[in-house]
Interface confidence: low
């Protein structure tokens, strides 16, 4: 099943997020991803946990998953590089870099997103954009077109409350509010964009969605700048 969803959001403006990628398994949407270089897509490591025998591909330039669009193109994956410290049973280091079979054809609907290199927390309350093709309600309806939602960043102390994530949010993670508007498992790997810069990647744990006591958890890309640079080099 697809890992993730945008709850309480709305349809995104078509092709306004040219960095947005759909990581696909056997031709079906599995996870979100974000184009960070001409030949590299950043996603979440857990996305490929169940993909051992399947064909993984990356769809770029898409708004609709099903409709023909001039900018759409499906790329094979040459190499999948999960973070070496990622583990199936934790949310830590949940990053994956996918090397495309060739450099993406760039254009208005396909363009890498600058990512944050300065390792500093985003200010609480900052509105950030998260997008994805995950299910849009608790009944499991899957959207065909890209959805997005604006979410305020939540301070780590609140996110680590006993009632929230009980100390699990390390300095390499960040949270966003989840008051009925939320990202979730299936938007895993998708981008959290603050001020036009990639700040976080949706983690792919089995978190309840849309529950204000269980804020969304995002991997802070700035905390992994050295690793990203070493893989892309």
């Amino acid at each position: 099943p697809p890992r993730g969803r945008i709850l309480g959001g709305r349809e995104a403006e078509a092709h306004a997020r040219p960095y947005m990628a759909s990581v696909q398994l056997n031709g079906a949407h599995l996870c979100g991803g974000v184009l960070v270089a001409e030949q590299w897509v950043l996603s979440a490591a857990h996305c490929l946990e169940d993909a051992a025998d399947g064909k993984v591909q990356v769809l770029l330039g898409a708004h609709s998953l099903s409709q023909p669009e001039p900018s759409k193109r499906l790329y094979d994956v040459l190499r999948a590089v999960p973070h070496p410290d990622s583990q199936p049973d934790t949310i830590d280091h949940d990053l994956l870099l996918l090397q495309l079979s060739e450099k993406a054809t760039l254009g208005p609907a396909v363009r890498p997103l600058p990512w944050q290199r300065v390792d500093r927390d985003v200010a609480p309350g900052t509105l950030c954009d998260v997008a994805g093709w995950g299910i849009v309600n608790h009944a499991g309806r899957r959207p065909d077109s890209l959805q997005h939602v604006l979410l305020p960043v939540l301070d780590r102390a609140t996110c680590n409350r006993r009632t929230h994530h009980d100390g699990a949010i390390t300095e390499r993670l960040m949270c966003a509010e989840s008051n009925r508007r939320d990202s979730c498992k299936g938007d895993s790997g998708g981008p959290l964009v603050c001020g036009g810069v990639l700040e976080g990647v949706v983690t792919s744990g089995s978190r309840v969605c849309g529950n204000r006591k269980k804020p969304g958890i995002y991997t802070r890309v700035a905390s992994y700048a050295a690793w990203i640079d070493s893989v892309l080099a």
Partner: antibody, heavy 114, light 108 residues
């Protein structure tokens, strides 16, 4: 449809205990904490505490520690609140609520009287 | 604990009139954790507004919410008969969660 079914009114004697059930349906019981709230006649609502149905973890309002005990039975998707050493001050309507109070039970009136 | 003070306690309003109910907090509350509920006699409370300004499902658009810090309000742009009820504010910004005493809205 999310439903929280609470039992009917209870008339109990001072010093006794009462256990109020709240049976949940229409959603995954373990997805949300169950909160309990007290409303005394003519008074504001008071939060008693909540329980995480996944692991039974509880957080209580200091005021109700020793008075209320929250438990759950996952197999029947039912949350319980036990009130002990009852006095006339405990006469009130008690509500269970979930989904961060998006959903409430209809309330159980507990009357403490000799 | 944070004390929420609602005013007025009772308000009589004519149909079509604009209504503003206020909720004042004894210390600052995060706007994300300020909620309003509607309660009618014999019924349980209903979530009405969440995160200060977001209307819950099924709530008419004539309702709105605003505020920040220690001062919050619920506004009805044009009072209707079905709006007669008690309205409670609620904060979950710090423990324990607390509720205001409510404002009872009556139809004149």
């Amino acid at each position: 449809e999310v439903l929280l079914q609470q039992s009917g009114p209870e008339l109990v004697k001072p010093g006794a205990s009462v256990k109020i059930p709240c049976k949940a349906s229409g959603y995954t019981f373990t997805d949300y904490d169950m909160d309990w709230v007290k409303q005394s006649h003519g008074k504001s609502l008071e939060w008693i505490g909540h329980i995480n149905p996944n692991n039974g973890g509880t957080i209580y309002n200091q005021k109700f520690k020793g008075k209320a005990t929250l438990t759950v039975d996952k197999s029947s998707s039912t949350a319980y609140m036990e009130l002990r050493s009852l006095t006339s001050e405990d006469t009130a309507v008690y509500y269970c609520g979930t989904g961060d109070f998006a959903y409430w039970g209809h309330g159980t009136l507990v009357t403490v009287s000799a | 604990q944070i004390v929420l003070t609602q005013s007025p306690a009772i308000m009589s309003v004519s149909p079509g009139e604009k209504v503003t109910l206020t909720c004042s907090a004894s210390s600052s509350v995060s706007s994300s954790y300020l909620y309003w509920y509607q309660k009618k006699p014999g019924s349980s409370p209903k979530l009405w507004i969440y995160s200060t300004s977001n209307l819950a499902s099924g709530v008419p658009a004539r309702f709105s919410g605003s505020g920040s810090g220690t001062s919050y309000s619920l506004t009805i742009s044009s009072m209707e008969a079905e709006d007669a009820a008690s309205y409670f504010c609620h904060q979950w910004s710090s423990y324990p969660p607390t509720f205001g005493a409510g404002t009872k809205l009556e139809l004149k």
